[in-house]
């Protein structure tokens, strides 16, 4: 998990003849808020699906009038980041599509008006936990600027935030077969365990220990199949010993959406449908005509010549909702189960898996462990769906064949000399340290600071870590 | 073998409505999307909407939205298409279509139930 | 809506004839095009899918081919159980749509 962050440094007119209009004027004032919209992939297949990655709206701009004459000049930005949070791992690759609005605030009928300025998209690759990228696009006379990146939030890190780190639970080491998270160097990584008998066909988890259910089935292990005849309410959370699902709280309780909308949950939050002459993100936009452009995706307005007078928007196919704001494909369907990113490619639908599922629709949980070998005595762990071999002292690599130099990543702390050995790797301290790592100081009176030297052993000799 | 087990044939009156069912056997019925298309006496085919059985999504035409209500029964594998405010344009044979081109390189066949002949008469 | 225009509606044919039924779509579909024969008081039965490939069990006699906005469906040698009436179908798009269909009658 983590979450992709966009700042936009700058709104204006691009270089070259032709300067844009100043989108504002005394009578229209107005303000400028963005969109964004994250795909995963590079490939043109990925720039038609939906945000899959996941949108996100800027706050309202300053409000802006137009000096009289003036050419546009930049144009008053919002203040923060916009923030889209990104639940399984980030792609690494990604398209984007950065829309610029203008909210105008002039006598309008029930409310303010919205109409796009600008829309600029692109493709790129970045690795989350890096520096901030800047950017610089144009679409047609405006121009602008932003930065952005992306970065993991804890426990995740790595370049994709696939990796899990957590506190060390012994001061010492981390786990068998588990490394220290680099930059995190006092954190292990931890491997993604479930809960344990968490059904493997209906539960999976995103963080250890838990056991979170698939659609239609429920109890703390996910091997409840939900019964709704008896339930009021199609929503958790659920009750393992019924199976039926008790009404919780959801994105739509209470109805955000304004003027008559009715909303239906999405994975990520709600969503309104909204009566004809109403649009926005909760049917707030009102009193519209067909002058203000109220279809999108190409939708044909007809009507609504005074606000009076109601519009309809005659949606082209593949578009639904009132202002034709849905785009409608199989996706829409949500074939893809287990996390997996649907495609629709017209002639046929595409699954792309998380890793540890296979089958047209994601539907096959893989058992990465059977017939892998671990060599040199390693054995296989599962994790998230991903085959690890946890290897033997003294051997590395995906399946253990490479013998490992244990001295290599310089373990012995403050000067101790790293010995390789057939059993791991031997520390010989430097004076004043003790520890399988040498990694305690010793206190001037002798005593060692945690944990004492075992019988037999004097602080600063060699001792075997097995 | 796949088999779509279609009910019965109705008469209605205007204004009522009819709720036909389509029972599935054969396959895992939660794989497929099911759609429903219709055919008036004489007439060519229209395609009403689609609903997947896994997770109750569905999608309608929109000539039919707010009238059309399609629902599943996963413990008896059944699909069934509710049609509201009938009139007598409504007058057709129902059918129950299994989706056929699904996913990409994997490719099952379409399959349709026996259809179900709804008349609409005062 | 992707309209889907077939020609022509009303086809006699011999058996051993070739005959060609084309569908025309109105805006580019890809090859998402399906071809069904229905017989009278029968549900329509799938014989090509993705434009050109032939579904399971279904005579070699029968080809489709066509991609973006014209299609067309091709039996090379008539039998007696091809005389039906044949369909298009786009499912590229929501809503799917069918075209108005072409009775092939005997001769």
């Known amino acids: 998990a983590g979450v992709f962050e966009l700042q936009i440094h700058s709104f204006g007119p691009g270089p070259g003849p032709g300067a844009p209009r100043s989108p504002c004027s005394a009578r229209l004032p107005c303000r400028l808020f963005f969109r964004v919209c994250l795909k995963p992939g590079l490939s043109e297949e990925a720039a038609e699906s939906p945000c899959a990655l996941g949108a996100a709206l800027s706050a309202r701009g300053p409000v802006y009038t137009e000096q009289p004459g003036a050419p546009a000049p930049d144009l008053p930005l919002p203040d923060g980041l916009l923030q889209v949070p990104f639940r399984d791992a980030w792609p690494g690759t990604f398209s984007f599509i950065i829309e610029t609005w203008r909210e105008e605030l002039g006598d309008q009928i029930g409310g303010p008006a919205w109409s796009l300025l600008a829309r600029v998209a692109g493709r790129r690759r970045l690795a989350a936990g890096g520096p901030w990228a800047r950017d610089i696009q144009r679409a047609g006379a405006w121009e602008l600027r932003f930065s952005y990146r992306a970065r993991c939030e804890p426990p995740a890190v790595g370049t994709a935030c696939t990796r899990l780190c957590r506190p060390r639970s012994a001061p010492s080491r981390c786990g068998p077969g588990l490394r220290p998270c680099a930059p995190l160097e006092d954190e292990c990584e931890a491997p993604l365990v479930c809960r344990a008998g968490c059904s493997p066909e209906h539960g999976f988890c995103e963080q250890p220990g838990e056991c979170r259910c698939l659609e239609g089935w429920t109890g703390p292990l996910c091997t409840v199949p939900v019964s709704t005849s008896s339930c009021l309410s199609p929503r958790g959370p659920s009750s393992a010993t019924t199976g039926c699902l008790v009404p919780g709280p959801g994105p739509c309780d209470g109805n955000p959406c304004a003027n008559g909308g009715s909303c239906s949950e999405t994975p990520r939050s709600f969503e309104c449908t909204c009566p004809r002459g109403f649009y926005g993100l909760r049917c707030e936009v009102s009193g519209v005509t067909c002058a203000d452009g109220p279809c999108f995706n190409g939708g044909l307005c007809v009507g609504g010549a005074d606000p009076d007078s109601a519009y309809i928007c005659h949606c082209p196919p593949g578009f639904q909702g009132s202002n034709c704001e849905k785009r409608v494909d199989r996706c829409s369907l949500q074939p893809c189960r287990n996390g997996g990113l649907c495609l629709d490619l017209g002639h046929a639908l595409r699954c792309r898996c998380r890793a540890g599922f296979a089958g047209p629709r994601c539907e096959h949980d893989l058992d990465d462990c059977a017939g892998r070998a671990c060599a040199n005595g390693g054995t296989c762990v599962e994790g998230g769906g991903a085959h690890r071999c946890s290897c033997a002292l003294g051997f590395g690599g995906r399946d253990c064949r490479e013998r490992a130099d244990p001295c290599a990543a310089r373990p012995c702390a403050h000067g101790g000399r790293c010995y390789a050995h057939f059993s791991g790797l031997v520390c010989a301290c430097a004076p004043g340290y003790m520890g399988a790592r040498c990694e305690f100081p010793v206190h001037p009176d002798g005593a060692s600071a945690l944990p004492a030297a075992p019988p037999g052993l004097r602080p600063g000799d060699p001792q075997r870590y097995l | 073998q796949v088999q779509l087990v279609q009910s019965g044939a109705e008469v209605k009156k205007p204004g009522a409505s009819v709720k036909v069912s389509c029972k599935a056997s054969?396959?895992?019925?939660?794989?497929?999307?099911m759609n429903w298309v219709r055919q008036a006496p004489g007439q060519g085919l229209e395609w009403m909407g689609v609903?997947?059985?896994?997770?109750?999504?569905?999608i309608y035409n929109q000539k039919f939205q707010g009238r059309v209500t399609m629902t599943v029964d996963r413990s008896t594998s059944t699909v069934y298409m509710e049609l509201s405010s009938l009139r007598s344009e409504d007058t057709a044979v129902y059918y129950c279509?299994?989706?056929?081109?699904?996913?990409?390189?994997?490719?099952?066949?379409?399959?349709w139930g026996q259809g179900t002949l709804v008349t609409v008469s005062s | 809506d992707i309209q889907l225009t077939q020609s022509p509606s009303f086809l006699s044919a011999s058996v051993g004839d070739r005959v060609t039924i084309t569908c025309k779509a109105s805006?580019?579909?890809?090859?998402?095009v399906a071809w069904y024969q229905q017989k009278p008081g029968k549900a329509p039965k799938l014989l090509i899918y993705?434009?050109?490939n032939r579904y399971t069990g279904v005579p070699s006699r029968f080809s489709g081919s066509g991609s973006g906005t014209e299609f067309t469906l091709t039996i090379s040698s008539l039998q007696p159980e091809d005389f039906a009436t044949y369909y298009c179908?786009?499912?590229?798009?929501?809503?799917?749509?069918f075209g108005q269909g072409t009775k092939l009658e005997i001769k």
């Open positions: 609903i997947n059985p896994y997770n109750d999504i569905t």
């Open positions: 054969g396959y895992t019925f939660t794989d497929y999307f």
């Open positions: 179908q786009q499912y590229s798009t929501y809503p799917y749509t």
């Open positions: 805006q580019n579909v890809g090859i998402a």
């Open positions: 993705a434009a050109s």
């Open positions: 279509a299994r989706e056929g081109v699904l996913y990409d390189g994997y490719y099952e066949g379409a399959y």
